[in-house]
């Protein structure tokens, strides 16, 4: 059905402009130009925007990035797909209603160091794992 | 807009019945009963259904499972969210148009052994990594 197609095809957001993305008809969700393959997108996160400026001293923000895009058949080599994702893609192809496509998720994540105040206003320098997306893949 | 809400909320398919899932209006996509949290779902994959029965000798199929569900704020401990996913959830909360929610993906995968014919009709026993979903999380 149109709804199930839309549901599956919209699992990964388009990287088109917001104006294009706002178009709401099912045909637009199906249009091939709206969908790009799973990849890393740049994203800078400001701790001030998150409301964390009162307890994070440094950095003021960081390049977090994010993963987005389609995990559709066939899964190319650059999509870093797992064997399970390949199988799931085939199952989805046979029965889109039953199983979703694999999703575009981080495959490599890096840490960042954060200087912050703890609950007692002591200053802590801590390495936070898995904060920066380095690579994406279909999972 | 309705389209952006639908796009974000449908990134992770509902586990409700297909009949419910077929309802296509935006309001249904927004309904809370349609969305369940990210978790592992059972899925048995038959190699015959995939058309692989001619080259895979054994097993005839396997419990592959798959991941599906919402990665919405707040991310609970059982969602096995990475630090990046927590940050991304907050950024999405602030600006749903700009960044998608994290997606529900495998966090633990197991291997299976497969007995199959190679291109020269030799029988090979090989361990295929990352074939079975053991756990899911928000990534």
């Amino acid at each position: 059905s149109a709804s199930s197609r839309r549901r599956q095809q919209s699992r990964n957001r388009s990287t088109q402009s917001q104006d294009v993305a706002r178009v709401s008809s099912a045909s637009d969700y199906n249009s091939s130009e709206l969908k790009t393959a799973c990849r890393k997108h740049e994203l800078y996160v400001s701790f001030q925007d998150l409301g964390w400026q009162d307890w994070i001293i440094a950095p003021k923000g960081y390049a977090a990035n994010y993963c987005d895009g389609e995990c559709s058949f066939p899964l190319n080599a650059h999509m870093n797909a797992t064997n399970h994702a390949i199988v799931q893609t085939l199952v989805h192809l046979m029965n889109p209603e039953y199983v979703p496509k694999p999703c575009c998720a981080p495959t490599k994540l890096n840490a960042i160091s954060v200087l912050y105040f703890d609950d007692n206003s002591n200053v802590i320098l801590k390495k936070y794992r898995n904060m920066v997306v380095r690579a994406c893949g279909c999972h | 807009s309705a389209s952006s809400r639908r796009r974000q909320q449908s990134r992770n398919r509902s586990t409700q019945s297909q009949d419910v899932a077929r309802v296509s209006s935006a309001s249904d996509y927004n309904s809370s009963e349609l969305k369940t949290a990210c978790r592992k779902h059972e899925l048995y994959v038959s190699f015959q259904d995939l058309g692989w029965q001619d080259w895979i000798i054994a097993p005839k199929g396997y419990a592959a499972n798959y991941c599906d569900g919402e990665c919405s704020f707040p991310l609970n401990a059982h969602m096995n969210a990475t630090n990046h996913a927590i940050v991304q959830t907050l950024v999405h909360l602030m600006n749903p148009e700009y960044v998608p929610k994290p997606c529900c993906a495998p966090t633990k995968l197991n291997a299976i052994s497969v007995l199959y014919f190679d291109d020269n009709s030799n029988v090979i026993l090989k361990k295929y990594r990352n074939m079975v979903v053991r756990a899911c999380g928000c990534h």
């Epitope: 001293i57 440094a58 002591n122 | -």
Partner: antibody, heavy 121, light 108 residues
């Protein structure tokens, strides 16, 4: 190069409120944390508190109930108010910058030249 | 709070001599978050050392810092006439930020 200049009344009556301002030149107040430190005559140094330009503050618990530090980004200034002063609050009051990055935190550099505030009737 | 105890209270030395100043913390100072300052009469303190051992910009290399945990030392390898002053240690890892009582280095 960054310079800090304290200003305010040199004499405050007991039980009144001490008010001082630190004007920052040569740098944006938005880049660092900013602190007040005091030194009673002939004695050691005591940290009063610090502020980030967004308004978040941290105070010395021994003074917290009487102290307010605020910031005015438009004027590149931050201020100290200390209520219910007594003779024990007589001191040279310094403002200072706190470096605040991953590799640099918590030390005071540079300092203002200091201003003597005497609490007396 | 972390109490910093400096010793000796006064150090009487001649120019050219080596000065060793001690700063002992009542509990461990995290990440060696300790600084040393020099203060001359009528002047504001001046940063010498941060991070227990890193020299601040423009500070002569005769000044050096060492130590970790609870015991820290400021060493002036060869005293110059302008080095006679009061020296303070400060910890900035725990709240409240605290200073030692100071060591006065005077001319013998």
């Amino acid at each position: 190069q960054v310079q800090l200049q304290e200003s305010g009344p040199g004499l405050v009556k007991p039980s009144e409120t001490l008010s001082l301002t630190c004007t920052v030149s040569g740098d944006s107040i938005r880049s660092y944390y900013w602190s007040w430190i005091r030194q009673p005559p002939g004695k050691g140094l005591e940290w009063i508190g610090y502020i980030y330009y967004r308004g978040s503050t941290h105070y010395n618990p021994s003074l917290k109930s009487r102290v307010t530090i605020s910031v005015d980004t438009s004027k590149n200034q931050f201020s100290l108010k200390m209520s219910s002063v007594t003779a024990a609050d007589t001191a040279v009051y310094y403002c200072a910058r706190i470096c605040s990055s991953i590799s640099c935190w918590g030390w005071f550099d540079p300092w203002g030249q200091g201003t003597l505030v005497t609490v007396s009737s | 709070e972390i109490v910093l105890t400096q010793s000796p209270g006064t150090l009487s030395l001649s120019p050219g001599e080596r000065a060793t100043l001690s700063c002992r913390a009542s509990q461990s100072v995290s990440s060696s978050y300790l600084a040393w300052y020099q203060q001359k009469p009528g002047q504001a303190p001046r940063l010498l050392i941060y991070g227990a051992s890193s020299r601040a910009t423009g500070i002569p290399d005769r000044f050096s810092g060492s130590g970790s945990g609870t015991d820290f030392t400021l060493t002036i390898s060869r005293l110059e006439p302008e080095d006679f002053a009061v020296y303070y240690c400060q910890q900035y890892g725990s709240s409240p930020l605290t200073f030692g009582g100071g060591t006065k280095v005077e001319i013998k």
